[in-house]
Every structure is written in structure tokens, then in C-alpha cells.
């Protein structure tokens, strides 16, 4: 897609398997052609996307993107759930597919599973 | 434009592993899903699990949890799928396909594997 | 997980007619984000399937004119308005909101 429109590069249905206790960069990729927009993260709580205010975020620069992170620090088990953002652009809404962040809280885990284990049973981490 | 090519034709004895592969071209893998459907001589489709290239998640239907893993190497633009346990009604031809990740604007399937399971 | 149900079985047409085919899903397809993902297939005798529609209604790059999709919900049809030589297949319908992907059993459109 080459247009001069702003997008937001999240997959649809993607997810991250993370641990409580660790640091965690959510990533919102952006491309815009003259002025970056304003980007913000929201919660999905049901339909409703509750805007996350007071968090610390940053932007880091690429050749032909630039990325509005989402700093986890450290992972809560209550920052399980689904994430969205949204860019601001000649005053419409963009908006991300959503991401999700399955939580695995190591206190109640035995020991941490493989990777191979929580990509293939999301079901299994915290919920 | 994206074309998948998919390994050769395997014949398996029961109990055995196949590992089928499929490279992409065309594209930056990191943006898109691949997944793997099969084909019963015969039958219709059935999805197998996809993977997500960029972090190596992978998701599977019931029927091949624990069975089935599918992998992706990005150096290289190449998925992966093996299957394990091999049994008689495991012969299929094995798809691969690629799709976009953001808006599904593309979706395109490799030539197919067929797997002769055979003791 | 969905069950998705096609009809006819087998569809049996001349060249120039036009082909309706059905595709009824066992809960709704529409996603949270407002799209339908549900998609149409061709496959021909000893080839891989390939897409023709998506988002039910939203033409592949390269597929003619005649070929339509439209639906909503948990009932979906692929039209061909003037069937040509080239068009008879296997027809599949397969979704894409939930996990897993599921696939209807297939139509087969043959000559009359």
C-alpha cells in the first residue's frame, strides 16, 4: 500500500507470551509522509478501548518507520489483555488492529514454560 | 510478486516424522502469516496451525496440537512444518500460504507436498 | 469451533449461465473490528486452491468481474453472473474471524 495516508502496523490477532516481573516494549509501528501524528495506546476492556494515560511511551526513529512504544516496567499480571493504538491525522482516527499480551505470572508457575509451549497454548497463560 | 515454493514429495512409514518446507519470495515475511492446510486425496481442506514469522508464534487447530509444529526462519524466508506420529490417514498433500498480516490484501498458496504415509 | 456448510454439493450448469453458491456459518463471522473474514476458493483438478474473494465481498487482484461475493453474518454467496469454460471447479468457502480456520466441505461446479 503507497499512500500518503497514516498506518499503523500491527498484525491482526497478533500476540506476545511475557512474564510478570520482566520489561516489555510494545511496539506500534507508524508510517506518515510530512508530520508524525499523535499516537496513543488504549486497553480493550469488552468494546470499549480505554486510553492509557500517564504511561511511559517513547518513539524510536527507523529508515521508513517510526514506532510509538508502550513500556512495561516491570509486567504486571494485570497487563494481561489486548491493546490497540491510534494515530490522529488531519483530525480522523486510525486505528491498529489489536495486539494481545498473554501474562504468565512465574510466582504461580512452577518454572517458566518454553517459548515453544506458550506460543502454541496461549490458553494455558494467565488469564 | 509472492510465490511460495514447497519441498518435494516424501513417503513415511507409521510412526515416523515428516518436515515439509516452503520458501517465500517476493516478500518481507515479517509482515504476513503463513500457514499450512492439507488435502486428503479426495477430500476438502483442513486447517493445520499458522505461524506469525516475526516473533514465532505459532497457533493450531485441536486436532494437531502436540502433533504438528510449525516454524519459520527468517534468514531465509522459509516455513516449516513437521508432523509426528505419522498414521495411514496422514496422507494428504500438505499446502503452505502466505497472507498479509495488516490487511490481508494478499494470499497465496504454494504448489503442494503430498505426504504418502505406507508401511 | 465454526461449522461452515455449503449448498449445493454439486452445482451443474452450461456456459452462460450464472452459478449461486452457499455458504452458512454456525455463528457469526463478523469480527470485533467490524470486518467479516470470510473467504472464497477455486481449485482445480491437481492444482493448489487459490483465493478469489475476501472480506466476502472484495476481489482478488487478477479474478474477473463475474465472479461477486456478498453476505453478512452467518450467511455468505459466491455468484460467477456468466459462467465460462475456465470456471469449472471445486468452490470452497473458509472463515477467518476465528481459531481455528475452518472450511466449508467444497461445491463443485461441473458442466451440464
Known amino acids: 500500500k503507497e499512500s500518503c495516508d497514516v498506518q499503523l502496523y500491527i498484525k491482526r490477532q497478533s500476540y506476545h507470551s511475557i512474564f510478570a516481573g520482566d520489561p516489555f516494549k510494545l511496539e506500534c509501528p507508524v508510517k506518515y509522509c510530512a508530520h508524525r501524528p499523535q499516537v496513543t495506546w488504549c486497553k480493550l476492556n469488552g468494546t470499549t478501548c480505554v486510553k492509557l494515560e500517564g504511561r511511559h511511551t517513547s518513539w524510536k526513529q527507523e529508515k521508513n518507520l517510526s514506532f510509538f512504544i508502550l513500556h512495561f516496567e516491570p509486567v504486571l499480571p494485570s497487563d494481561n489483555g489486548s491493546y490497540r493504538c491510534s494515530a490522529n491525522f488531519l483530525s480522523a482516527i486510525i486505528e491498529s488492529h489489536s495486539t494481545t499480551l498473554y501474562v504468565t505470572d512465574v510466582k504461580s508457575a512452577s518454572e517458566r514454560p518454553s517459548k515453544d509451549e506458550m506460543a502454541s497454548r496461549p490458553w494455558l497463560l494467565y488469564s | 510478486q509472492v510465490q511460495l515454493v514447497q519441498s518435494g514429495a516424501e513417503v513415511k512409514k507409521p510412526g515416523s516424522s515428516v518436515k515439509v518446507s516452503c520458501k517465500a519470495s517476493g516478500v518481507n515475511i515479517k509482515d504476513t502469516y503463513m500457514y499450512w492446510v492439507r488435502q486428503a486425496p479426495g477430500q476438502g481442506l483442513e486447517w493445520i496451525g499458522r505461524i506469525d514469522p516475526a516473533n514465532g508464534y505459532a497457533r493450531y487447530a485441536q486436532k494437531f496440537q502436540g502433533r504438528a509444529t510449525i516454524t519459520a526462519d527468517e534468514s531465509t524466508s522459509t516455513a516449516y512444518m513437521e508432523l509426528s506420529s505419522l498414521r495411514s490417514e496422514d496422507t494428504a498433500v500438505y499446502y503452505c500460504?502466505?497472507?498479509?498480516?495488516?490487511?490481508?490484501?494478499?494470499?497465496?498458496w504454494g504448489q503442494g507436498t503430498l505426504v504418502t504415509v505406507s508401511s | 469451533e465454526i461449522v461452515l456448510t455449503q449448498s449445493p454439493g454439486t452445482l451443474s450448469v452450461s456456459p452462460g449461465e450464472r452459478a449461486t453458491i452457499s455458504c452458512r456459518s454456525s455463528q457469526s463471522l463478523l469480527d470485533s473490528d467490524g470486518k467479516t473474514y470470510l473467504n472464497w476458493l477455486q481449485q482445480k483438478p491437481g492444482q493448489a486452491p487459490r483465493r478469489l474473494i475476501y472480506l466476502v465481498s472484495k476481489r482478488d487482484t487478477g479474478v474477473p468481474d463475474r465472479f461477486s461475493g456478498s453476505g453478512s453474518g452467518t450467511d455468505f454467496t459466491l455468484t460467477i453472473s456468466r459462467v465460462e469454460p475456465e470456471d469449472f471447479a471445486v468452490y470452497y468457502c473458509?472463515?477467518?474471524?476465528?481459531?481455528?480456520?475452518?472450511f466449508g466441505q467444497g461445491t463443485k461446479l461441473e458442466i451440464k
Open positions: 473458509w472463515q477467518g474471524t476465528l481459531f481455528p480456520r475452518t
Open positions: 500460504a502466505v497472507y498479509d498480516g495488516y490487511y490481508e490484501s494478499f494470499d497465496v
